[in-house]
């Protein structure tokens, strides 16, 4: 019985977990999904029983080997995965566990621009970046376009501060999961600056 | 890659006993089981047995247990199968072939097959 | 030992037509059949294993069914080089057995 073994997956894709063993005589194998059955493989006889027959399209077994393929990957087969070997050989069975973490392929990142003032002509304001639908485990960069890949700041809010007659730089920022990484259209702070500054005037005219 | 390598022909007195060989290479020898399958010219396959190079042991099909010999060699990764006092009937093509994990009397990787014919 | 039934000694068929072979059991193997696929001058290859497992890089026209004693492995959209004979095995328990083999042929 080894570690956890971490696995990463996306949806409608396909993950394998790993499975090897040198026991000769193998009588089953049981696979569990968050303690439900899943498979059980007797190898002499060669029968494979999957549990649930919407999962038989599913499960593949890669070489003919005992390593476990699951493919057509949805959210919620995020959890954890237990193997057991069971042999007469062997005093009790060997063991391993895993656990699978699914995740969507990011959408397009919106960027939302907070509470602005402008002060002597400085505009200051916070661009914050996020996803429509609430993914999980997303980590946010922001770039300054034509700086090469030069991140220059970590987090989903920027701060940014921005003099009149200044020279204007895209912005845009990055969101990236395990699987998959997006970018947000480009936002130059002049125009935002500028387009806020007319919405302000409109309103008080 | 896998590869299971075989002698491409043998020509066998009748009475003479005659050892084929099967070079495994590519994969773990002594993991899987290594089966011996005869092929009649013009006819279909028939299991003659199995061995395990780990232990040798033997799974024979009663029909070949006075006829063949499954033997093996770990340190060449090599498979063997002895025919004893052959007869016309053994001229045959016969194949070594690997089991696989999942399903261990299912075979995977196939050599060429060994041509013997018996002929005085 | 048990006896695998291949009832078709031959079919013909034309390319990009759905064929299948049945092959029966003489007991329960449940699902511990194999379908192989041999052409001439060639080894036999494995295509099928636990009656329904597609083997590693086998193309997906290439189907296997059923349980117990009766065993259907199906080719969807023949192609020439599909030409060939195919044999059942039952690998659920020794002596391993095969059955007589189908050949498929063009029209």
């Known amino acids: 019985s080894g570690p956890v073994k971490e696995l990463v997956g996306s949806v409608g894709g396909a993950v394998t977990f790993p499975l090897k063993s040198k026991v000769k005589q193998v009588d089953s194998i049981v696979w569990t999904f968050n303690t439900t059955p899943l498979v059980t493989i007797q190898p002499e006889g060669g029968t494979i029983i999957v549990t649930q027959n919407r999962n038989r399209e599913r499960v593949d077994f890669p070489d003919g080997g005992y390593s476990l393929k699951l493919s057509k990957l949805k959210k919620n087969d995020s959890g954890i995965y237990y193997v057991g070997i069971y042999s007469s050989s062997l005093q009790q069975p060997s063991t391993q566990e895993y656990v699978l973490h699914v995740y969507e392929h990011l959408s397009k990142p919106k960027v939302t621009m907070g509470l602005q003032s402008n002060k002597n002509g400085t505009c200051v304001t916070n661009l914050t970046c996020c996803m429509e639908h609430g993914e999980e485990d997303v980590i946010y960069t922001w770039k300054a376009l034509g700086q090469g890949d030069n991140q220059f700041h970590d987090g989903a809010t920027l701060s940014i501060a921005w003099r009149s007659g200044e020279k204007d730089q895209a912005l845009t920022c990055m969101a990236r999961n395990p699987v998959s990484n997006s970018f947000s259209t480009p936002v130059f702070p002049q125009k935002l600056c500028e387009d806020a500054a007319t919405d302000l005037t409109s309103l008080r005219g | 890659q896998v590869q299971l390598q075989q002698p491409g022909a043998e020509l066998v007195r009748p009475g003479a006993s005659v050892k084929l060989s099967c070079k495994a290479s590519g994969y773990s020898f002594t993991t899987y089981w290594m089966n011996w399958v005869k092929q009649r010219p013009g006819q279909g396959l028939e299991w003659i047995g199995m061995?395990?190079?780990?232990?040798?042991?033997?799974r024979l099909n009663q029909k070949f247990k006075d006829k063949a010999t499954l033997t093996v060699d770990k340190s060449s990764s090599t498979a063997y199968m002895q025919l004893s006092s052959p007869t016309s009937e053994d001229s045959a093509v016969y194949y070594c072939a690997r089991s696989t994990m999942i399903a261990t009397r299912a075979m995977d990787y196939w050599g060429q097959g060994t041509s013997v014919t018996v002929s005085s | 030992d048990i006896v695998m039934t291949q009832s078709q000694k031959s079919m013909s068929t034309s390319v990009g037509d759905r064929v299948s072979i049945t092959c029966k059991a003489s007991q329960d193997v449940i699902t511990g059949v194999a379908w192989y696929q041999q052409k001439p001058g060639q080894s036999p290859k494995l295509l099928i294993y636990s009656a329904s497992y597609r083997y590693t890089g086998v193309p997906d026209r290439f189907t296997g069914s059923g349980s117990g004693t009766d065993f259907t492995f199906t080719i969807s959209n023949v192609q020439a080089e599909d030409l060939a004979v195919y044999y059942c095995q039952q690998h659920y328990s020794t002596p391993l057995t095969f059955g007589a083999g189908t050949k498929l042929e063009l029209k």
């Open positions: 061995i395990h190079p780990s232990d040798s042991e033997t």
